[in-house]
């Protein structure tokens, strides 16, 4: 699984749904800002 790079990627809200004619990525931060280490990458396992 790849690490998540906060600095190089832009982000799109997964659940908001999309305008069928206009897909775009927002430039806001990812949905969770880690409290303990806000600049460290995070990853997610699909099957725990």
């Amino acid at each position: 699984m790849e690490d998540f790079n906060m600095e190089s990627d832009s982000f799109e809200d997964f659940w908001k749904g999309e305008d069928l004619s206009n897909y775009s990525y927002s430039s806001t931060l990812p949905p969770f800002l880690l409290d303990a280490a806000p600049c460290e990458p995070e990853s997610l396992e699909i099957n725990k």
Epitope: F14, L20, P30, P31, L34
Partner: antibody
Amino acid sequence: QVQLVQSGAEVKKPGSSVKVSCKASGGTLSSYAISWVRQAPGQGPEWMGWINPNSGGTNYAQKFQGRVTMTRDTSISTAYMELSRLRPDDTAVYYCASGYCSPSGCYVYWGQGTLVTVSS
Amino acid sequence: QAVLTQPSSLSASPGASVSLTCTLRSGINVGAYRIYWYQQKPGSPPQFLLRYKSDSDKQQGSGVPSRFSGSRDASANAGILLISGLRSEDEADYYCAIWHSSAWVFGGGTQLTVLG
């Protein structure tokens, strides 16, 4: 790793309300929508709506309009879903979920689920 | 008629390739939608696998193996989840979903059984 941690199972009487919480453990809620999805026993998922944690803005599925209320308390990184006028067919596992996509892939987070049983 | 229709069950042997279909209701054109696919195992929430609209508009879920892929069959007005090199751990329920009329709509799911 960020996790969404939900409140425990509930048993409710028909006509009453239930309020389920969803806390971001290890992180803080940000601007991305938190959806609530329920799943009745043996059935597929059913989307109930979402809340924008920053603004508090909501988008409810038509089926639940007038019966569901989604709120959040950013000071404790927690979102809430309240469903009123409960019926037996509201018996389901209720999940919160959030996530985002970057050009390199999508990251989707789910709570562990909260079983709500509606029974007289 | 349901917005999204999936076959209720499917079985295949380890190592095989399987195609799970998600047929959109007549009047809803598959070419206009991203089709989202989820895997769910008993006692766990659904897990996002991938979304697919076209070869230039597709994304994998984080950590999802490349043997899970998407496509579409325009003639059948259906989205397709292809699982290659089937493994025993792929035994699960699979759901498709689309964003339609300002709401997320899920299919009824396909129960995939891995034989043997």
